[in-house]
């Protein structure tokens, strides 16, 4: 359909990260149209011939889809008419990283926006008290990271202290030969203190906290994606 004389519509994307082996979302929103058949969504990837995904006339059109995305993409169909063109990407691969373009055409106009999609692996750390050690120690474990992250310890009581001398970190390659298990042990811990294990790469930052007292152990963890 023609859009001559129509204006450019605002398309907005958000840099995001995909966790290898899991499902991810490439976010894109646009000025909505009131009719579904007026909306065309095309997702393209830099360096790839063919389309990542196309949605038009209320249906997916995968006739020009590149084979690396076959069976792995979907739009949130019920949300298209309210301006959501985000793409669901199943089973994220390391090779999915790159620059994507979300291109929108509606009966009101057209527009596009790029997004950087980073891929890697990130997971929540779990800290446990290691009672087997000769002195009381803490063991921080996170099952899946890539690229190799940095690990640092911190403590509420000894703020600013460098724990590298009293900790030991190892990275163990997982069976798929890409992601790694992170294990870090902090020795000589004191009771009635809160310790934090911080794992970070260029995609994500995860923190595990543990508070050890005479009567109980309290844990908390959080994961934050770095949209840099």
């Amino acid at each position: 359909f023609g859009i001559s004389g129509k204006h450019f519509i605002t398309v907005t994307t958000f840099t995001s990260a995909g966790n290898i082996g899991e499902d991810g979302t490439l976010s894109c929103t646009f000025e909505p149209d009131i009719k579904l058949n007026g909306i065309v969504i095309q997702w393209l990837k830099e360096g790839i011939k063919g389309l990542v995904h196309e949605f038009k006339e209320g249906k997916d059109d995968l006739s020009q889809q590149h084979e690396m995305f076959r069976g792995r993409t979907a739009v949130f169909a019920d949300q298209v008419v309210v301006g959501n063109a985000s793409l669901r990407l199943k089973n994220v691969q390391l090779t999915d990283a790159g620059t994507y373009t979300c291109y929108i055409r509606t009966s009101k106009g057209k527009g596009n926006a790029n997004l950087e999609y980073k891929t890697g692996a990130f997971s929540m750390p779990e800290i446990n008290v290691d009672y087997n050690a000769s002195s009381e120690s803490l063991r921080c474990e996170a099952p899946r990271w890539f690229p190799q992250p940095t690990v640092a310890w911190a403590s509420q009581v000894d703020q600013g202290a460098n724990f590298s001398e009293v900790s030991n970190t190892s990275f163990e390659l997982n069976s798929e030969n890409v992601t790694m298990k992170v294990v870090s042990v902090l020795y000589n811990v004191t009771i009635n203190n809160t310790y934090s294990c911080m794992i970070e790469n260029d995609i994500a930052k995860a923190t595990g906290d543990i508070k050890v007292t005479d009567s109980e152990v309290k844990r908390r963890s959080q994961l934050q994606l770095l949209n840099s």
Epitope: H7, E31, P32, I34, K35, L36, N37, G38, E57, G58, K59, A77, D78, Q79, V81, V82, G83, K108
Partner: antibody
């Protein structure tokens, strides 16, 4: 929470005009289409037109072109529909409704317009 | 314009019974159909969007299905508050159009 509050009932003489308002709150007024729907007494629903306040784009049902004119004032988050050259068949409840997360997910309470000589 | 035809016009049922309301589009509208419930003196309320997505807060006895030209709203077991008029509506193309409505009344 999202709310659409419409102006009160109107009684008009044939040939006159009426302007119905719909004040929106609880969401970003400029980011979503506002629609107007007619329901004549004992009848079904009829879509009149819609406006996108972000850029004042409008879409009209051909049947209501020349009858209805819709506008939006972003500073007050209010949409308006003016009906001109009123006739008895324009007697109806008029609803404003918006599409925030789904189609027509929020509705105004309706404005009864009665055309009578 | 796309014509939406609802049937039956009236459905007389008892509480606890299953209600099946149909809506037929005059051309393919993909999944772009919503269902609304309207009670006397009230504005319509969204029940189902995009043919089968139950709107927030709508009881799970309401379900929608269909794509293309044939759509169904099912109320698995009628509650007293479900007796009302139900409308289907397409947002595939303009003008947006509604069906004529199905009145579900107490038998």
């Amino acid at each position: 929470q999202v709310q659409l509050v419409q102006s009160g009932a109107e009684v008009k003489k044939p040939g006159a005009s009426v302007k119905v308002s719909c004040k929106a709150s609880g969401y970003t007024f400029t980011s979503y289409w506002m629609h107007w729907v007619k329901q004549a007494p004992g009848q079904g629903l009829e879509w009149i037109a819609a406006i996108y306040p972000g850029n004042s784009d409008t879409d009209y049902n051909q049947k209501f072109k020349g009858k209805a004119k819709i506008t939006a004032v972003t500073s007050t988050s209010t949409a308006y529909m003016e009906l001109s050259s009123l006739r008895s068949e324009d007697t109806a409840v008029y609803y404003c409704t918006t599409t925030v997360a789904h189609y027509f997910d929020y509705w105004g309470q309706g404005t009864m317009v009665t055309v009578s000589s | 314009e796309i014509v939406m035809t609802q049937s039956p016009a009236t459905l007389s049922l008892s509480p606890g019974e299953r209600a099946t309301l149909t809506c037929k589009a005059s051309q393919d509208v993909s999944f772009a159909v919503a269902w609304y419930q309207q009670k006397p003196g009230q504005a319509p309320k969204l029940l189902i969007s995009s043919a089968s997505y139950r709107y927030t807060g709508v009881p799970d006895r309401f379900s929608g299905s269909g794509s293309g030209t044939d759509f169904t709203l099912t109320i698995s077991s009628l509650e007293p508050e479900d007796f009302a008029v139900y409308y289907c509506q397409q947002h595939y193309n303009t003008p947006l159009t509604f069906g004529g409505g199905t009145k579900v009344e107490i038998k």
